[in-house]
């Protein structure tokens, strides 16, 4: 008795039904629960980075649900009283607990599907999430660590004479910053209460061959660089330009 | 076998603290609700506390709530009752409980033997 | 004084069929299921019924229950010696916002 196991080889999936907003899941489908049903008893909890503004669908151990007695999804958010939503087979009774908000729901009806979901994933989402099922063989559990990814926002200037700064904006979690070619560097972290973090980099280059530099943004939601020239005019800036 | 062990029972004074351990075994604790029942001696049950399988979620009964907090280790597979303020109609066999209806649609399948706590001066 | 009312007290032969009302009220067993436990003398309590109606592994069938509005009844047929002991109804009530015990009733086989 404990966590099912998912599939090793299973990969984000991009959901085709929602074309507003992509969508990402970590479930098997009917097929996969079958062939996985013997890993039922092996230990999980899935540290899931889920991009901001997506939907996400977070899902039950594959169980099949005519051997369920009751799901519950236990919900912990930074700072707020845990919400549980609970599932009732026999009865066909739902219930929950401290839930407020109406982002986080079942996919469909529980009967037919376990499955939570996500509407518009919002920092405020980071958090535990698990889901526990309750069936004659014992309790099963699956266990999401979400960590909400926000995109920082890039910019690259020459502040004064042979420096630029490169800048990641409200990233989270924080961006890493690296130069082509190197200079003299000096990196800045600024955290913000809702959790992002803004970082700074700023460097020098004595080398004046050096004519253009190259700021590369290294993040989980992708990658960008950005390249400026540098202009030897004291207090000259110049706008950088996006690969 | 699912096991359930309670310890930390004994005699204190009254206003006196105690605080209750059960230790569990034989199944994942994690994925349980868990309560403490009382009895007092030669009379009934009396349901004390109840704590979701991540401790997020607490119930107590009026009687003791303000004195009593409930607390679980998922790491140490341990359930506890811290109890203060205590009094002399504390006294009971304290037990431990399981609850697979996770709070939600409570009953309690599996129980411990129990610990008794005397308050008397 | 127990939010659900059972007998105090309950009796019959070997082989007899007895039963055990346990009454309470619609924030309790009118809404929210009935669980009945078994307590041998100086042991810990016992799940006998569960969801009003369902018995666990190795519970043997002469014990069965059900319940009706606010009252719950545990049958037992082909009453046993073993039987003797007290038994208990509880339901979560959503009124105390906590789970309620009868006061018990002490079972005698004759």
């Known amino acids: 008795e404990g966590a099912a196991q998912p599939n090793n080889s299973l990969m984000l999936q991009t959901s085709k039904e929602n074309h507003a907003l992509a969508s990402s899941s970590l479930c098997m489908d009917e097929k996969q629960i079958t062939q996985n049903y013997s890993k039922v008893l092996a230990e999980v909890n899935t540290s899931w980075p889920v991009k901001m503004a997506t939907n996400a669908v977070l899902c039950c151990p594959p169980i099949a649900l005519r051997n369920l007695i009751i799901i519950t999804w236990e919900i912990i958010l930074r700072g707020q009283p845990s919400c549980t939503k609970a599932y009732k087979k026999e009865t066909n009774e739902t219930k929950e607990t401290n839930c407020t908000d109406e982002r986080i729901t079942w996919v469909s009806r529980p009967d037919q599907n376990s499955d939570l979901q996500i509407r518009t994933v919002a920092i405020t989402h980071d958090g535990y999430y698990r889901c526990i099922m309750v069936t004659p063989d014992g309790n099963f559990h699956r266990g999401y660590h979400l960590q909400v990814l926000v995109t920082p926002e890039v910019t690259l200037f020459q502040n004064r004479n042979r420096t630029a700064v490169c800048k990641a904006v409200a990233g989270k979690p924080a961006a890493h910053i690296s130069w082509i070619p190197e200079g003299d560097c000096a990196t800045k972290q600024e955290y913000w209460s809702n959790g992002t973090v803004t970082v700074k980099s700023t460097c020098h280059w004595e080398v004046h061959n050096v004519s253009t530099v190259t700021c590369h943004v290294s993040h989980l939601t992708g990658n960008k660089s950005l390249y400026i020239e540098l202009l030897p005019v004291p207090g000259a800036k110049k706008s950088a330009k996006l690969y | 076998e699912v096991q359930l062990l309670e310890s930390g029972g004994g005699l204190v004074q009254p206003g006196g603290s105690l605080r209750l351990s059960c230790a569990a075994s034989?199944?994942?604790?994690?994925?349980?609700?868990m309560s403490w029942v009382r009895q007092a001696p030669g009379k009934g049950l009396e349901w004390v506390s109840s704590?979701?399988?991540?401790?997020?979620?607490?119930y107590y009964a009026d009687s003791v709530k303000g004195r009593f907090t409930i607390s679980r280790d998922n790491s140490k597979n341990t359930l506890y009752l811290q109890m203060n303020s205590l009094r002399a109609e504390d006294t009971a066999v304290y037990y431990c409980?399981?609850?697979?209806?996770?709070?939600?649609?409570?009953?309690?399948?599996?129980w411990g033997q129990g610990t008794l706590v005397t308050v008397s001066s | 004084q127990s939010v659900l009312t059972q007998p105090p007290s309950a009796s019959g032969t070997p082989g007899q069929r007895v039963t055990i009302s346990c009454t309470g009220s619609?924030?309790?067993?009118?809404?929210?299921?009935v669980s009945w436990y078994q307590q041998l003398p100086g042991t810990a309590p016992k799940l006998l019924i569960y969801?009003?109606?369902h018995r666990p592994s190795g519970v043997p069938d002469r014990f069965s229950g059900s319940k009706s509005g606010t009252s719950a009844s545990l049958a037992i047929s082909g009453l046993r010696s073993e039987d003797e002991a007290d038994y208990y109804c509880?339901?979560?009530?959503?009124?105390?916002?906590?789970?309620?015990f009868g006061g018990g009733t002490k079972l005698t086989v004759l």
């Open positions: 409980a399981r609850d697979p209806g996770q709070m939600f649609w409570p009953l309690f399948d599996y």
């Open positions: 034989g199944f994942t604790f994690s994925n349980y609700a």
């Open positions: 704590i979701s399988p991540g401790g997020g979620s607490i």
């Open positions: 619609s924030s309790n067993i009118g809404s929210n299921n």
């Open positions: 969801d009003d109606s």
């Open positions: 509880g339901s979560w009530d959503a009124s105390l916002n906590g789970y309620v």
